[in-house]
């Protein structure tokens, strides 16, 4: 006889990344007919919702409206059928972002190079942190962590085209409490070792695409946005 | 104390070449860069060369008519410049392991103080 109903997911949108004083929606999707749904946050319960009918609604969506570090952490969900219960969901870590001030990203040595070239990015940031984070923009991001006084070096080691990209840094408070985004740089790799050159690129990222790309586990696992319950375990754990 | 200095610079007509020197002391670094200035626009990267592994790489606006080496025994670091047009005239710098900083901003602890290539028509 089963015991426990299998976990449900849990992600947020539109990121987990949130900027503070921005909404942010933290979503929990069971199985249809599940009477009940808990958020907890840091192990303790924090909100409920009853879904109507539930027969018909597999998910159901907790509202913040103005995102500050007392609300950022590590949250999961459980829901109910009847009386039976789920396993709870993975962990998801909801980080504040924009908090205090902005690291200045730099890239050993240029941005545009050769593939076999040592690349190396450097974060940097005077206020009182000494962890960073280098990230890179797209669905399947990879992150790094990285520590020092005021400055992180982030060795990529010989680069090959899939270091291709756009990347960012934050400096780190804690876990859950991120600077505002450095910069943007565009790091721009050439396959052939022969074609030593590159037209000139201004490094564009548009604000509105910040929050539209995903990290991916450990595990490398890649999901459709709507089933994300991973959220970057790798790197805040 | 580290230094870079520059030497080389000077007046030639168009098609002409020069070569520029930057004397590196102090101690060893990973890559020295050329980047050149021209009145009233922003420092553009022209050539950077790895100290060890020699690989080199250009700007789009210089390859194929300048060349970047350097020889290890004297610590020196050269920019052959060949085809000279008027829109290379600018102060050159070389500078140790500079990086790139977003919107076309470079950053180094070293700089040289340049040296002044002007390519008359």
């Known amino acids: 006889q089963q015991q426990t109903l299998p976990k449900p997911f849990i992600w947020a949108e539109p990121h987990f990344m949130v900027p503070k004083e921005k909404q942010v929606t933290i979503c929990c999707q069971g199985n249809y007919g599940a009477v009940e749904y808990q958020l907890h946050f840091e192990g303790s319960l924090f909100a409920v919702d009853r879904p109507k009918p539930p027969e018909r609604i597999n998910k159901v969506q907790f509202y913040i409206p103005d995102m500050n570090s007392r609300m950022a952490g590590q949250y999961s969900c459980i829901y109910r059928v009847g009386e039976l219960w789920s396993e709870p969901s993975n962990l998801l870590d909801l980080v504040v972002t924009e908090m205090y001030d902005t690291p200045t990203l730099s890239v050993h040595p240029g941005p545009e190079v050769i593939s076999g070239e040592k690349v190396t990015f450097y974060c940097r940031l005077d206020t009182a942190t000494s962890m960073f984070l280098l990230l890179k923009e797209g669905r399947s991001s990879h992150v790094q962590r990285g520590y020092g006084k005021v400055q992180a070096e982030f060795p990529l080691g010989p680069v090959t085209t899939a270091h291709r990209g756009t990347y960012r840094c934050f400096g780190s408070y804690n876990n859950h409490a991120w600077s505002f985004p450095s910069e943007p740089v565009k790091l721009l790799v050439t396959g052939d070792i022969e074609n030593t050159s590159l037209a000139p690129e201004d490094p564009t990222f548009p604000a509105d695409t910040w929050g539209t790309y995903l990290l991916t586990t450990e595990t490398g696992l890649q999901k459709d946005h709507a089933l994300w319950d991973h959220t970057a375990q790798n790197l805040l754990r | 104390d580290v230094q870079l200095v520059e030497s080389g610079g000077g007046l030639v007509q168009a098609g002409g070449s020069l070569r520029l020197s930057c004397a590196a002391s102090g101690r060893t670094f990973n890559t020295i860069h050329w980047f050149r200035q021209a009145p009233g626009k922003e420092r553009e990267f022209v050539a950077r060369?790895?100290?060890?592994?020699?690989?080199?790489f250009y700007a789009a606006s210089v390859k194929g008519r300048f060349t970047i080496s350097r020889d290890n025994a004297k610590n020196m670091v050269y920019l052959q410049m060949n085809s000279l047009k008027p829109e290379d005239t600018a102060v050159y710098y070389c500078?140790?392991?500079?990086?790139?900083?977003?919107?076309?901003?470079?950053?180094?602890?070293?700089w040289g103080q340049g040296t002044q290539v002007t390519v008359s028509s």
């Open positions: 060369i790895w100290w060890i592994e020699r690989t080199t």
């Open positions: 500078a140790a392991d500079a990086r790139y900083t977003g919107s076309r901003r470079w950053e180094s602890d070293y």
